[in-house]
Interface confidence: low
């Protein structure tokens, strides 16, 4: 019996087609993805093949103006229109709190939304009961397939799930649910979830009875053969893990932003054992037409967005590189721009001894969600910035000891190379890392811009000195694992809305040209 699994993950509000780098579509003939194009391909496969499941592994929420304006209603509407069979909760589904998940998505979705390792407690337990499930048994042709969900246990550090949701260890939580499915005579089980590729592989290895793992969160691109676009494969598709009980378990993920549709064919024997698996992500490029009825619906929903955000704020004469491939690995000029805007927004001439009260900025690279292409006449709009900074956060002022800053920069590279969001972009700081050293001892140079000076210059960080730093509220609250900031900050003052800070700076500067200038170096 053959099953076709179509899967998406980390779509992040890319309802419309995008450029190849997943930023706003500029040249339509070269654009990719979007729900109208996805629908065309999904329907083509549904027509051609008998047993098809369309699954999403989380993080539909957050990423463009669509989410800023519609707050998840767009996710429910278009996922319903595409007739997804199931979705796992991602960390970003909690970005607007639990209410922002329940009302627009959980109550409106016509498909099951899953997570086995999220447990509700207190008054929330009865309110959310039945709105998401640990698993769902889906009829597919003459057979049934069990789908069990999971969500990153790091979600409390990455989003806003509140205090009444407990995020358990994925493997610990999944095993009893899989066992339950087995007792229900379900012998074909897919783990669908959002914890990253490393955890996906662990689930495949450790959870007895899971036949296939469909993941997300780490934006992992897997491909067998010559990849069709710019993404470099992290391994073959599917990635095969040998489980502790000796089975070959296929693990898949489909990069992100709706650029690809994961396509996995699994053959099961009569006992539900996987006997073969093959496939590849399908690049949703312009050779696939956009479905006219979905496109018309998109255009109808678009009207509200156009009013919101289309006026020009200023111009860029350089490419603003906000790609995860840059900002999570090295200094990127989008990070420099944002940090410069954050400092500029906090210019307060104190007295003759200080040129300013604050000179330093840190910004988690994972908070930068999109590039901006200068080839669109250089125009920068609020909409462009909403794609770069979609989280609706604030840029806050904190006071930290030098020793805390040092810990933060060690944390920035403690697991360097996995495309994780904690890699820091900076302003008013020069940092040098040596990645050959062990984690926790990789910061070999940390110089900070003086404030008590008439001519600003860089001086070595003093561990016992107290410094003012501008940073996202996300970091001040210990997000992305920066617990040391939350625990050790000496003062925290809320600041202005992030997009507004950057848009004001761009409007003020009129024309911008941020460079990569050696703020972050590797020895």
């Amino acid at each position: 019996w053959e099953l076709t699994i179509l899967h998406t993950n980390d779509v992040h509000s890319r309802l419309e087609q995008t450029s190849e780098d997943s930023s706003k579509c500029v040249n339509a003939s070269r654009c990719m993805g979007g729900v109208a194009r996805l629908f065309t391909k999904v329907q083509q496969i549904r027509r051609a093949e008998p047993n098809v499941l369309l699954l999403d592994a989380g993080d539909q929420y957050q990423g463009t103006i669509w989410f800023t304006v519609y707050k998840g209603a767009e996710v429910a509407h278009f996922m319903n229109a595409l007739r997804y069979d199931a979705m796992a909760l991602g960390n970003h589904e909690f970005d607007n709190g639990v209410e922002g998940l329940i009302e627009p998505l959980l109550k409106e979705a016509k498909f099951p939304i899953l997570s086995a390792n999220i447990k509700a407690k207190g008054p929330l337990a009865s309110q959310i009961s039945g709105l998401y499930l640990p698993y769902k048994v889906l009829p597919v042709g003459d057979e049934v397939v069990g789908i069990v969900g999971y969500t990153s246990k790091e979600t409390p550090f990455l989003s806003n799930p509140g205090t009444n949701l407990v995020f358990e260890d994925e493997i610990t939580a999944l095993q009893p649910e899989v066992d339950k499915l087995k007792t229900l005579n379900v012998n074909k089980i897919i783990a669908l979830g959002h914890s990253g590729f490393e955890t996906d592989k662990l689930i495949a290895q450790k959870v007895r009875g899971v036949d296939v793992v469909v993941g997300g969160h780490s934006n992992t691109f897997l491909y067998t053969g010559n990849p069709p676009s710019k993404e470099v494969p992290a391994g073959k598709y599917p990635f095969i893990v040998t489980s502790d009980d000796g089975r070959k378990v296929p693990v898949v993920q489909a990069y992100a932003f709706g650029k690809y549709l994961g396509y996995l064919k699994i053959e099961f024997d009569e006992r539900g054992n996987v006997i073969s698996s093959h496939g590849n992500p399908i690049l949703l490029n312009s050779s696939i037409p956009e479905d006219p009825s979905i496109k018309a619906d998109i255009n109808k929903w678009r009207i509200k967005l156009d009013n919101y955000s289309t006026q020009e704020l200023g111009k860029t004469i350089v490419y603003l590189d906000g790609s995860s491939q840059s900002c999570r690995f090295r200094e990127c000029n989008m990070g420099n721009l944002i940090c410069d805007a954050m400092i500029n927004n906090n210019l307060r001439h104190a007295d003759e001894m200080f040129w300013n009260h604050v000179s330093m900025c840190i910004l988690n690279g994972g908070g930068i969600r999109s590039p901006i292409d200068e080839r669109n006449n250089g125009t920068i709009t609020w909409e462009n910035l909403a794609a770069v900074l979609p989280f609706g956060g604030t840029f806050d002022l904190v006071q930290l000891k030098g020793s805390t800053l040092k810990k933060a920069f060690e944390h920035s590279v403690h697991r360097y190379g996995q495309s994780t969001g904690e890699f820091l972009q900076v302003g008013g700081i020069h940092v040098v890392y040596d990645l050959s050293r062990k984690p926790g001892d990789r910061v070999v140079k940390l110089d900070v811009l003086c404030t008590k000076c008439r001519v600003p210059s860089y001086d070595p960080l003093k561990m016992d000195e107290i410094y003012k730093v501008i940073l996202p509220n996300f970091l001040a609250n210990g997000g992305d694992g920066f617990q040391m900031i939350k625990d050790e900050l000496l003062r925290h003052d809320s600041g202005d809305q992030d997009i507004n800070v950057v848009s004001t700076y761009i409007s003020k500067m009129k024309v911008i040209y941020p460079a990569v200038e050696g703020r972050i170096k590797f020895s």
Epitope: Q43, R46, R47, A81, R83, K110
Partner: antibody
Amino acid sequence: EVQLVESGGGLVQPGRSLRLSCAASGFTFDDYAMHWVRQAPGKGLEWVSGISWNSNSIGYADSVRGRFTISRDNAKNSLYLQMNSLRAEDTALYYCAKDMGWELLKTSYYGMDVWGQGTTVTVSS
Amino acid sequence: QTVVTQEPSASGTPGQRVTISCSGSSSNIGGNTVNWYQQLPGTAPKLLIYSNNQRPSGVPDRFSGSKSGISASLAISGLQSEDEADYYCAAWDDSLNGRVFGGGTKLTVLG
């Protein structure tokens, strides 16, 4: 029990109108596309019209386009066929049918897996 | 006129294998998938095959479908008296932008 029950058929003069209804039960109505199919006495099946789960896609046979209008009310689990300018050749048993899928256009690997018993429309002067 | 054609009648004896064919064009059968319906005398049609060769639950495996080019066929093995019925093929037609049914084949079980 999954069931479709048609009503509204009858004897009508040429040029007049008739509205057929189909009441659905036993399944989640708004998860599926729906169709009207007719069968003239002693003849074969003819697809008349279809409508997607959310009414976004609608299709008609050439023989009825411009005269017939299909609609649905998901809140009432009901499908309708408004038939105007009726002709003698519209005389048939009209079946309401549930699709296995939710879309209408070209998703033809899905079949019509539940049918009503039909309602008779006779157009005669 | 019917854009998808079927032979008007077919027959067979109990236990025999019979095949009913359906012929169309590139705009219907050639480019899309085929469904088959059975209509017993005096009853509503019943879906027998979808997606060229897939049986809904409850349909015996004596019924099988296939498609090649612009033609499709329904095979019934181990013919039984209760198989006496009208059989219709159906497909989406890209030119007409709608579903089309074949003219139907009346199957008679002899003896």
